[in-house]
């Protein structure tokens, strides 16, 4: 679809005569008839296959034709066509004299023709005007013409329809050839697909407008390239959505069970060595001079009772010093000047001579120690109890009293809070750092799933005669506890009046 435009510029008829040579009276009131048709090697009369147009009277004899397009006038003349422009044409322009106001062909005498020109040739679609001038014996016509496409039609022959749009069926303008030129941020054959934020993951992200990155379920992050782990995942990661792959040192469904307390909490103080001894449990091996579960207590060097044979210990800046009792000497009062004759063994210890009586050794009864059996055995000095267990001397032996959650001879084993199956009615038990949590099945609630939330079988008061009703939680039924004098599943029968049965 397009328009053949013809711009008449100047017509010269100096003598004011018709084609026959006869002069016009009083002058030639000139109007034009234009016929546009398909290409003919020799332009001949016949149908104006591409269209016709006529002008009003434009002037008398010789005149210039005003460009009237801006005022909505008829110059240039418009010959619209609704087909593919073939690139060739034939054009006939006739100048006629109008004696009166009726310009219809049948109203004019045949000899009212002033001049007739016919041209043919090639014409490409374009904005540029082709200027031409045709001269006959008595007249001269100067004009220009061109073919342009109608609005929204493009291409070499005005055959491509293209309408710019900016909605969800396309975001584009039209190029001169009729191809689409996508607006910034849009792509696709019809420019209907937004260009997502640069780097937005192809599979896991999408967008509904340019420079956006919306994540599909299970993905997150600016570029939708981070998976979302399982809900509740504490110390874990994922490679695909809803996973919970535990970080090193963590375990459990939600990676919330600490398998490496030492690394995560560094509980041991003063340079002690930490050893993991189970889930959420550890043991600290103290450096010399420190004690306590976490080696948090500083020991006096005298606390280890280094002085033997009743020697008294004095702390010094660079260590300690033993003050020995009479009859003993040495760094730790370990050498005796006594012999068995001096009865040096206490608490029923028996004395044995050594080195021909120059020395002696005491053999101590149970529960006593020391070179003179002067010390009661304290089996707790080595802090044998792990995980904060309390050491107790029990005569010849010792025992560890463990903190809640630990067991074993030395409290070295972590007791799973779930081991004793604390969740009632088939509840699922989860170990937590400070206790446990029960996930209850439908119909139960409470910290241990001990509360039945289903319909109370006693709610309908099924028991008669002031009997007490009990709900059997396992079967959702009731049991009636009858008062004295009544029997029956609902305590409905008085004793001595047996029910009447149909048999």
């Amino acid at each position: 679809s397009g328009v053949f435009q013809l711009q008449l510029q100047e017509f010269i008829n100096e003598r004011g005569v018709l084609a026959s040579g006869r002069p016009c009276e009083p002058g030639c009131r000139t109007f034009f008839r234009v016929c546009l048709k398909h290409f003919q090697a020799v332009v001949s009369p016949g149908p104006c296959t591409f269209g016709t147009v006529s002008t009003p009277v434009l002037g008398t004899n010789s005149f210039a034709v005003r460009d009237d397009s801006s005022g909505g006038g008829r110059n240039p003349l418009q010959l619209p066509f609704n087909f593919t422009w073939p690139g060739t044409f034939s054009l006939i322009i006739e100048a006629w004299h109008a004696p009166g106001d009726d310009l219809r062909p049948e109203a004019l005498p045949p000899d009212a023709l002033i001049s007739k020109i016919a041209i043919q040739g090639s014409l490409a679609v374009g904005q540029n005007w082709l200027l031409d001038e045709q001269t006959s014996t008595l007249t001269r016509l100067r004009y220009s013409y061109r073919v342009i496409c109608s609005d929204n039609y493009y291409g070499d022959n005005c055959s491509r329809l293209c309408k710019k749009r900016n909605d969800h069926f396309g975001h584009y303008v039209c190029q001169p050839d009729g191809n689409l030129s996508c607006l910034p941020g849009w792509t696709g054959e019809y420019c209907q697909q937004p260009i997502c934020l640069s780097g937005c993951h192809e599979q896991n992200g999408y967008c509904s407008k340019p420079a956006e990155c919306l994540c599909r379920p299970g993905w997150q992050g600016r570029l939708c390239n981070e998976c979302i782990p399982h809900n509740g995942c504490r110390h874990g990661t994922c490679s695909t959505p809803w996973q919970c792959t535990c970080d090193e040192g963590w375990g459990g469904l939600f990676c919330d069970q600490d398998l490496n307390y030492c690394t995560h909490h560094s509980p041991c103080k003063n340079g002690a060595t930490c050893s993991n001894s189970g889930q959420r449990s550890y043991t600290c091996t103290c450096r010399p001079g420190y004690t306590g579960v976490d080696c948090e207590l500083e020991l006096s060097e005298c606390d280890s009772n280094p002085c033997r044979n009743g020697g008294s210990c004095k702390d010094q800046e660079d260590g300690y010093h033993c003050l020995c009792p009479p009859g003993y000497y040495g760094l730790h009062c370990e050498h005796s000047t006594l012999s068995c004759a001096d009865s040096p063994c206490f608490n029923g210890g028996s004395c044995r001579e050594r080195n021909q009586g120059a020395n002696y050794a005491c053999e101590c009864p149970p529960n006593f120690t020391g070179s003179n059996c002067e010390k009661k055995v304290d089996r707790c000095t080595s802090n044998p109890c792990a995980n904060g267990g309390q050491c107790l001397n029990r005569g010849p032996s010792r025992m560890c009293r463990c903190r809640p959650g630990f067991t074993g001879t030395y409290c070295e084993l972590h007791v799973s809070d779930c081991a004793r199956n604390p969740c009632a009615h088939g509840g699922t038990c989860h170990d937590l750092e400070n206790g446990l949590m029960c996930t209850c099945p439908a119909g139960f609630s409470g910290r241990r799933c001990e509360v039945r939330t289903s319909i109370d079988a006693c709610a309908s008061s099924p028991c008669f005669n002031r009997a007490t009703c009990y709900t059997d939680l396992s079967t959702d039924t009731f049991v009636c506890n009858c008062p004295y004098g009544f029997v029956g599943s609902r305590c409905e029968f008085p004793v001595g009046l047996p029910p009447s049965f149909p048999w």
């Epitope: 609005d151 929204n152 329809l161 309408k163 710019k164 749009r165 900016n166 909605d167 969800h168 069926f169 396309g170 696709g188 054959e189 019809y190 209907q192 697909q193 999408y206 967008c207 509904s208 919306l214």
Partner: antibody
């Protein structure tokens, strides 16, 4: 051959929410060439475009119904749905689902057979 | 809001040409579609992109669109063409239908 089939209750009470589902067979709802629309026609009256949705979930609604209408898509089931809240008797109509083709410049080449929804107490 | 105006009815004798107009502001700058709807049936697309026919639509249906008016022309109208006809265009992101024209074949 692509087919569209509307389903949902034929009677809705005033002030309640109208819910319809359109099931697409014979073609994928995730094809980037198509949008999926809802159109309605009150008895004896003309067609009214309600809104449409793209497989990504982008929605477009008629401003005259905005605030009351929600269209969603479930690509796994090859379905899209319409919800119209706070209905009145004026929402009584035959509701059609249709396929809008980008290549046809938004023309709807396939329609469901339509389902009559009456709003009445 | 954008409106498309159609004549309520058009009557035509069999074999004659029926023309249905659809008017809207600068409609020629939008793509017009036309739908045929027979009683009790779903609409059928007969023209898209102003003047193109989907496969299966007879050649007697043609369309044009320029200025403020789109036109559906049924040449050599047949009794089976008796139906309601709706024009449709997109205004930004909103679909707009004309009010519909009832074509009666006398």
């Amino acid at each position: 051959e692509v087919q569209l089939q509307e389903s949902g209750p034929g009677l809705v009470k005033p002030s309640e929410t109208l819910s319809l589902t359109c099931t697409v067979s014979g073609g994928s709802i995730s094809n980037s060439r198509y949008h999926w629309g809802w159109i309605r026609q009150p008895p004896g009256k003309g067609l009214e475009w309600i809104g449409d949705i793209y497989y990504t979930g982008s929605t477009y609604y008629n401003p005259s119904l905005k605030g009351r209408v929600t269209i969603s898509v479930d690509t796994s089931k090859n379905q899209f749905s319409l919800k119209l809240s706070s209905v009145t008797a004026a929402d009584t109509a035959v509701y059609y689902c249709a396929r809008e083709d980008v290549i046809l410049r938004g023309g709807s080449d396939y329609w469901g057979q339509g389902t009559l929804v009456t709003v009445s107490s | 809001s954008y409106e498309l105006t159609q004549p309520p009815s058009v009557s035509v004798s069999p074999g004659q040409t029926a023309s249905i107009t659809c008017s809207g502001q600068r409609l020629g700058d939008k793509y017009a579609s036309w739908y045929q709807q027979k009683p009790g049936q779903s609409p059928v697309l007969v023209i898209y992109e102003d003047s193109k026919r989907p496969s299966g639509i007879p050649e007697r249906f043609s369309g044009s669109n320029s200025g403020d008016t789109a036109t559906l022309t049924i040449s050599g109208t047949q009794p089976m063409d008796e139906a309601d006809y709706y024009c449709q265009a997109w205004d930004r992101d909103t679909g707009v239908f004309g009010y519909g024209t009832k074509v009666t074949v006398l």
